[in-house]
Amino acid sequence: EDWQCPRTPYAASRDFDVKYVVPSFSAGGLVQAMVTYEGDRNESAVFVAIRNRLHVLGPDLKSVQSLATGPAGDPGCQTCAACGPGPHGPPGDTDTKVLVLDPALPALVSCGSSLQGRCFLHDLEPQGTAVHLAAPACLFSAHHNRPDDCPDCVASPLGTRVTVVEQGQASYFYVASSLDAAVAASFSPRSVSIRRLKADASGFAPGFVALSVLPKHLVSYSIEYVHSFHTGAFVYFLTVQPASVTDDPSALHTRLARLSATEPELGDYRELVLDCRFAPKRRRRGAPEGGQPYPVLRVAHSAPVGAQLATELSIAEGQEVLFGVFVTGKDGGPGVGPNSVVCAFPIDLLDTLIDEGVERCCESPVHPGLRRGLDFFQSPSFCPNPPGLEALSPNTSCRHFPLLVSSSFSRVDLFNGLLGPVQVTALYVTRLDNVTVAHMGTMDGRILQVELVRSLNYLLYVSNFSLGDSGQPVQRDVSRLGDHLLFASGDQVFQVPIQGPGCRHFLTCGRCLRAWHFMGCGWCGNMCGQQKECPGSWQQDHCPPKLTEFHPHSGPLRGSTRLTLCGSNFYLHPSGLVPEGTHQVTVGQSPCRPLPKDSSKLRPVPRKDFVEEFECELEPLGTQAVGPTNVSLTVTNMPPGKHFRVDGTSVLRGFSFMEPVLIAVQPLFGPRAGGTCLTLEGQSLSVGTSRAVLVNGTECLLARVSEGQLLCATPPGATVASVPLSLQVGGAQVPGSWTFQYRED
């Protein structure tokens, strides 16, 4: 009989239904934009925009100030008033499309859907640890803007991304806007532009550089700008757009656009297609070679990575990596595979690929038929010619014109499809110690904080909790303030510690103390918590063993029982080796002697499951009484493990000492050849782990065992004779004198 401990799924060591309450702010309307500010003198603020209003919050998410940003045409609109007395049309709500910090001043810049997409500059005024907004400056000069040429028209009602870069004494706004024919006709926003903020804050300098979707493509070719960021010498925009100007506009893919952050020019504008795939370890029949494509970027964030992930990505620790969450299509619902996948694109590698693409286009010999691309922005041409020109004239450089790199950058899902049905809607990546953590918001209003690591077949969670009861999607933009991240969902802003909201979701001491150091988890009594939550004994160095089950549940009062104990924190050594004198098991008053692990029975335990087994030989003391009792495991003097040492006692009820009684045996005779089916009747015949029926000292092969009955087949007899028949349970003979008669066959 080889009983094995039942597997405990790894998920049983945590509970993601544990409620965490994190600080929040109700904005009074759907949050449209959010940005944080941290000053040099310990002052900080959170700026939250909703329709027609801008809130200023302190670091504690308490309201400090509120500003009316609309409706345009309403005299109560405070930002509108900064543009002076009239004319005030056209009336309309102000949806905030841009909310960015200009770090040079410092100032907050907000741009809305009303008033031709103009922007307002709000100087920041520190007041203690809080920040107030000074009276806004209207970045719009009525006399300098026309419908066909409007340097001060920044925001598109269809969406705009802005990154502010300091160059010398000036602030340059790198602006990317989604357009359609109607928007393009109204005060002419541009698809991509670099605009210099005028020193007197009266607007943006005229004559700025820009690229725009050509009028003939505006109806069919729309570009969504998902994210923008500045790192090193470049500003990057991430887009979702049709894969081709000529083909089906619903066939989308993701591109990265790179612009120089040191020169306000667009001659070195470059685009690169980003290809993210889910490549399951075992490919299904009919699944595409190279994995299933996830062409549509949903959210992105760039961050320096920790040592472990850096090694897996073959880059140096601290290098910047662009992380993107991708889905199969605009609706995000695939037929097979996970809903969301996460791909990592090291920035240095992106830059190298772009530079190689430029070489392919501009350095001889150029592959015939290699196109410059970006036909939605410029006239079609072949490399190395400039757009719209048949040949390169001596005074133009191939490199000084926008280019789509001819090869794409392909990566596979870091999570190996383990996000499953989760639809990720927000992403922020941080480095904590040497660990890289993805903080993700979901479609159903949850936050997942997961270690970014590639080599596992399960997710390493810091946390997985619901932000509130509304279940509304977490919005795309996430901001950091100190050691917290700010997520928006519905009309609320939530402040989530980057170390996780707490430790209560870890249910076992072992899982608790195995948590990352940065989480600050410790064990207090019977729960996992941070020190501030534990009024009593809080410690991070040891765990008691935990008994969850044992087998068998009964044993003979005389004779031994091989007891198998199940649980966790028994020895913390994969080999199952138990140092001498560390583990003491008692059943009732009786000791149970530890047995060495049978190496042939060692099974590899997948990390998604966990259970530990421990075996001992129970020999009841003479003083042991019949009846129910407890099983107790005490572990002491254990050497420290990787995360903690095992120390303490675990007690489990439910073992019973019993006395087997043999009442009847039949038949009492049978052929000398053997094979007679003997039935032994009695009580407690199945207790313990071993039993044997002996006919003249030879084992009668057991066919069935139950509490009241044993069936066995007699062995052959040496001669015709009456021979002794006995029953042993746990190696000890059950009282009674019985004989079996061998007869001629």
Epitope: G73, P75, G76, C80, A82, P85, P136, S141
Partner: antibody, heavy 121, light 107 residues
């Protein structure tokens, strides 16, 4: 304390010139539209001119267009009104006023005490 | 230009009286209307902005109402310091224009 203080008024002959100044204090002058408003003796209030925060754009009442010039020096927190070709009907108390934004949008929320300009031969 | 017409041009009342001054705009100015109080030899002071919003520090006995073309300033219970001239002003567009004023005097 938020304050506006006008100066430069006085008696001038028809056809003559005068330059009014308005010194601002207690607020970020460079953020606000500034205005001149006048009031003839025993009469009502009349808006004269306004200037953008940067000083780049200006607007005038028809009655003074081409004769008056509004300007500002944000580094000195000062507003000016250069009045040329003065006429008898320009006789008035000239007030400098701030155009409100935060708190009190779209109104003259701060006024100076006024300076008297008399055009007479 | 937007015309602003105030009535009455003058008004006699006693302390404790409820007083109403009206202002008519032509054409429609939404709620872009402000009310000012001016005492002799003093600068005007803002009482009400955006037709009905009370300026900070102004007593609550002053209130404003109306939108479009017809507006009202009400003083619920006249106090001795309220005897002054009152002006309405449109802030809808330039040129900014004022009503001709209403002189409120002690009966």
């Amino acid at each position: 304390e938020v304050q506006l203080l006008e100066s430069g008024g006085g008696l001038v002959q028809p056809g003559g010139s005068l330059r009014l100044s308005c010194a601002a204090s207690g607020f970020t002058f460079s953020k606000y539209f500034m205005m001149w408003v006048r009031q003839a003796p025993g009469k009502g209030l009349e808006w004269v001119s306004s200037i953008y925060p940067s000083g780049g754009d200006t607007t005038y009442a028809d009655s003074v267009k081409g004769r008056f010039t509004i300007s500002r020096d944000n580094s000195k927190n000062t507003l000016y009104l250069q009045m040329n070709s003065l006429r008898a009907e320009d006789t008035a108390v000239y007030y400098c006023a701030r155009w409100g934004i935060v708190g009190v949008p779209n109104a003259f929320d701060i006024w100076g005490q006024g300076t008297m300009v008399t055009v007479s031969s | 230009d937007i015309q602003m017409t105030q009535s009455p041009s003058s008004l006699s009342a006693s302390v404790g009286d409820r007083v109403t001054i009206t202002c008519r705009a032509s054409p429609d100015i939404g709620t872009y209307l402000n009310w000012y109080q001016q005492k002799p030899r003093k600068a005007p002071q803002l009482l009400i902005y955006a037709a009905s919003s009370l300026q900070s520090g102004v007593p609550s006995r002053f209130s404003g109402s109306g939108s479009g073309t017809d507006f009202t300033l009400t003083i619920s219970s006249l106090q001795p310091e309220d005897f002054a001239t009152y002006y309405c002003q449109q802030s809808y567009t330039t040129p900014l224009t004022f009503g001709q004023g209403t002189r409120l005097e002690l009966k």
